[in-house]
């Protein structure tokens, strides 16, 4: 007789789960020698040991400590790019600018990004047929937490100026409700946090507005003056000219605004 | 099959510089996610981690021997070399060299079968 | 640098018995600790990594657990063949360190 499995509304646990993660990390520690201590079997323990055999509506930030402390790294805290709903240029601008760094360039963020996974209450099953949706299902699934846990501290670690890339072709710029503006935002630290420098990406070729006159951008703006944070934002006009002058920093037309 | 054999002087006078080679098989520093590192066991003591080389060359030591140790690798010759200045009678000891892997932390899995090094005037 | 605490620092068994090795670190290692055994005059022999995994051709009556500073080793059947020092390692950072060594002798 089939067992009677929970109907998730959101995809399945990635194929081939542990196995990308297990080749993931390998592939970080080769590329970043400071991480080549990384117990990659211990850090497979610990992600599967966070959701395996738990409900997938009842995960913790506790659940994930483990793993957060096989991951721990240090990360030059002047260095740090937020983004939001713009993940592929801002991977594209550190993957120039070697310097900065996404959390998707840190080892946790790099195990699981683009992946979902979600377990059973009471088996040691991995759910490949469906996983809660954040909406429809609930919000402390394994993936939304892994991502808010991870979030809020890398958040937590930057310091001086902190970076955001912000979409301008959404029509919510800042989003409340994103990882940025529901966990960054609010775990930037003002000790430490000097200025919160938002990058405004425009879609259109022919768009010149000043989108950092939105009312979302003037929203996030009230939201870190009130935390005792100054703030600055910068249009960026043309993100496939930006991308060239920070590779070509010297190049004569880097000159003009982008 | 992984084999790693060392090799070097049997006895050095005190203030010399100790240089051993380790040569291995089955194992190539020219692939990808490959390290060697160098172990010692002074007689009837504990195992005592001295250093180790990786593939692209990234090189860690223990700090308490770092002023004294120089690890190299030399691909071709599937060779990793250790040199270790102004040696000591307490450096006598049994020197290993093993095989490390990356993903795997610093586990050492393949070992040779040693060469005992005494140090004495 | 971690200190790996070793005990006990010898110990005789019979053939057959349950043998347990303990191993203390001096600060949270999580799970990267492994163990070796060594036989006279020859190289250590890794047996478990990571606390709890059998190293590929280990036999199953060979095992470790434990996590953050408290680690076991363990016989579940001694056998002849087992008469050996066994050492714990910490290959959590560098410096790489090991514990002093159990002696295991037969009764």
């Known amino acids: 007789v089939p067992r009677w499995r929970q109907q998730w509304s959101g995809p399945g646990t990635t194929k081939r789960f542990p196995e990308t993660v297990l080749a993931r990390c390998v592939k970080y520690t080769e590329i970043h020698p400071e991480m080549r201590h990384v117990d990659c079997q211990s850090v497979w323990d610990a992600f599967k040991g966070a959701f395996i055999s738990k409900h997938p509506c009842n995960i913790t930030e506790e659940d994930y400590q483990p793993l957060v402390k096989l991951g721990t790294q240090t990360v030059p805290c002047n260095k740090i790019l937020l983004w939001s709903r713009i993940k592929d240029l801002a991977h594209q601008f550190t993957q120039v600018q070697r310097d900065m760094f996404t959390l998707e360039d840190m080892l946790l963020g790099y195990l699981a990004d683009d992946l979902t996974w979600c377990g059973e209450f009471n088996t040691s099953k991995i759910n490949y047929q469906s996983c809660p949706d954040w909406r429809k299902d609930c919000s402390n699934n394994p993936v939304s937490v892994f991502w808010k846990t991870v979030s809020r501290r890398f958040a937590e670690a930057a310091c001086d100026v902190v970076h955001v890339m912000l979409n301008g072709s959404r029509s919510k710029i800042f989003d409340k409700n994103s990882t940025f503006g529901s966990v960054e935002v609010h775990n930037l630290q003002p000790e430490k946090v000097q200025t919160l420098e938002a990058w405004v990406i425009h879609g259109g070729r022919e768009d010149s507005r000043d989108l950092c006159q939105d009312p979302t951008i003037k929203e996030l703006e009230s939201i870190i003056s009130k935390r005792n944070i100054q703030f600055s934002c910068k249009n960026i006009y043309r993100p496939d000219k930006f991308l060239q002058c920070v590779k070509n920093p010297e190049d004569s037309s880097c000159t003009s605004e982008i | 099959q992984v084999t790693l054999k060392e090799s070097g002087p049997t006895l050095v006078k005190p203030t010399q510089t100790l240089t051993l080679t380790c040569t291995f098989s089955?194992?190539?520093?020219?692939?990808?996610?490959?390290?060697v590192g160098w172990i010692r066991q002074p007689p009837g003591k504990a195992l005592e981690w001295l250093a180790h080389?990786?593939?692209?060359?990234?090189?860690r030591y223990n700090p308490a021997l770092k002023s004294r140790l120089t690890i190299t690798k030399d691909t071709s010759k599937n060779q990793v070399v250790l040199t270790m200045t102004n040696m000591d009678p307490v450096d006598t000891a049994t020197y290993y060299c093993?095989?490390?892997?990356?993903?795997?932390?610093?586990?050492?899995?393949?070992w040779g079968q040693g060469t005992l090094v005494t140090v004495s005037s | 640098d971690i200190q790996m605490t070793q005990s006990p620092s010898s110990l005789s068994a019979s053939v057959g018995d349950r043998v347990t090795i303990t191993c203390q670190a001096s600060?949270?290692?999580?799970?990267?600790v492994a163990w070796f055994q060594q036989k006279p005059g020859k190289a250590p022999k890794l047996l478990i990594y990571s606390a709890s995994y059998r190293y590929t051709g280990v036999p199953s009556r060979f095992s470790g657990s434990g996590s953050g500073t408290d680690f076991t080793f363990t016989i579940s059947s001694l056998q002849p063949e087992d008469i050996a020092t066994y050492y714990c390692?910490?290959?959590?950072?560098?410096?790489?360190?090991f514990g002093q060594g159990t002696k295991l002798e037969i009764k």
């Open positions: 600060q949270d290692v999580i799970t990267s």
């Open positions: 089955g194992l190539s520093l020219s692939t990808s996610g490959k390290g």
């Open positions: 093993a095989r490390i892997e990356l993903g795997r932390s610093y586990v050492m899995d393949y």
């Open positions: 390692q910490q290959h959590y950072t560098i410096p790489l360190t």
């Open positions: 080389i990786w593939w692209d060359d990234d090189k």
